[in-house]
């Protein structure tokens, strides 16, 4: 469905302003911050969500070893520039004319520079590793059950096609979810792994982006799965370009 017609809200993005001013009096929703129209039948892009967040009033061994090129979002929040499709622009700058290049999930992938910095293309993040630690339980979860429920979650809540959930690894209490999506695999209408990972991250933090839905309540055979920490690693189709100074710091 698009924006809920009865009370004109956006089920997939509560950081919107909605009104019945679309064609034929249909409900149309615009993202806070950017004012861009959003499709409420699917996830909103991370760029528009970050922009909306910055505009809102401030108020919180079988396991995979991330590769040497994996990025972690250490820079935190910033007010991004989004293109007309809602994607991150390859080059981001702050108010003091400090610029840097980002990948498709908005994570910095170069050293910071000045306005002369060039970012030729938006490099796609094709592999995301979500590393979770769950709270202690009476016993370990069954790996197959955990895999089934996490796949169901990404499929049902985030509408991510199962083929993009490459693997679910488990060594109690660590769970790793691998999302993979090459440019060639992503068809029109497919949810982007970066957007799904961002919605999941916000859900885990108890900051759900969905309108009116309860927070994330994940259970495996009736046993609550409560996450106590999350780390997300991003791998790009082209390795990031940082100076040796950063790498040895």
């Amino acid at each position: 469905h698009t924006a809920a017609q009865d009370n004109c809200t956006c089920p997939t993005n509560k950081m919107t302003v909605c009104s019945p001013d679309g064609p034929g009096g249909r409900c149309q929703c615009r993202a806070l911050g950017s004012g861009m129209a959003v499709d409420c039948s699917t996830l909103t892009s991370k760029c528009l969500l970050l922009k909306a967040r910055m505009s809102a009033p401030k108020n919180a061994r079988t396991l995979v070893r991330p590769s040497e090129h994996a990025l972690v979002d250490n820079d935190g929040l910033y007010d991004p520039d989004c293109d007309p499709e809602g994607r991150f622009k390859a080059r981001q700058c702050n108010q003091t004319s400090v610029c840097w290049c980002v990948n498709s999930v908005g994570v910095r992938r170069t050293d910071k520079g000045d306005l002369s910095l060039r970012c030729d293309e938006l490099v796609r993040t094709h592999h995301i590793l979500i590393d979770l630690r769950h709270r202690p339980t009476a016993g370990a979860f069954n790996h197959s059950d955990l895999d089934a429920e996490l796949r169901r979650l990404f499929r049902e809540r985030y509408r991510l096609h199962p083929k993009f959930v490459a693997a679910v690894h488990y060594e109690q209490p660590t769970i790793q979810i691998e999302l993979r999506q090459n440019t060639s695999q992503k068809a029109a209408g497919d949810v982007d792994i970066g957007d799904a990972a961002y919605y999941f991250e916000r859900d885990i933090k108890g900051e759900s982006l969905f309108q009116g839905r309860g927070g994330l309540d994940l259970r495996v055979r009736g046993e609550p799965l409560q996450v106590e920490r999350t780390l997300i690693y991003y791998l790009d189709e082209i390795p990031p370009k940082f100076s040796m100074k950063r790498l040895t710091a």
Epitope: S144, D147, A148, E149, R155, G222, E223
Partner: antibody, heavy 117, light 111 residues
Amino acid sequence: QVQLQESGPGLVKPSQTLKLTCTVSGYSISSGYYWNWIRQPPGKGLEWIGYISYSGRNLYNPSLKSRVTISRDTSKNQFSLKLSSVTAADTAVYYCARDTTAYFDYWGQGTLVTVSS
Amino acid sequence: DIRMTQSPSSLSASVGDRVTITCRASESVSSSVNRFLHWYQQKPGKAPKLLIYRASNLESGVPSRFSGSGSGTDFTLTISSLQPEDFATYYCQQSNEDPYTFGQGTKLEIK
């Protein structure tokens, strides 16, 4: 022992709304799992209609989504199916079933609903 | 939607026979850990009964003469030695993708 029992009218007129209820005993529907409706037209195969989860989330078969609502009453440990604008093609045995981790381990005995004027 | 195709549609066999039913999915229903393919038995006028879950796991209380195998798109249900109570219709079901879908069924009859 988990048990599911369907109830509701056996005859519905065309264009009306079919309403069925599944009463669950032996397990609280808000404690876990996914609570499904599945149907089987006479002499035919099985068709998944949709579910309501332990937390109240819904998922429906896109082929029926515009006509289906699955809701629950946790105080009675029941979940219900509403199918609007029915036609003769909706004549079927309707089953409720529990989805454990994406397979159906417990089923109701089924109830035949005939759509006819 | 994932299309599930069972073969044969019907099968005549005798008590004591070894019987194999196959189920083919229109796309893979496996993950790195799981095979989201399940088998059910249905007798006339009764609800389906779970036999095998995740391709090869025998549901509690189901006789060991039933077994399942396969991965990806091709799966098999085997009954090692048919018993009189096994004459029924068998369905496969995938749960890798929404909507969940079932095979058209295989009717197992007495020869």
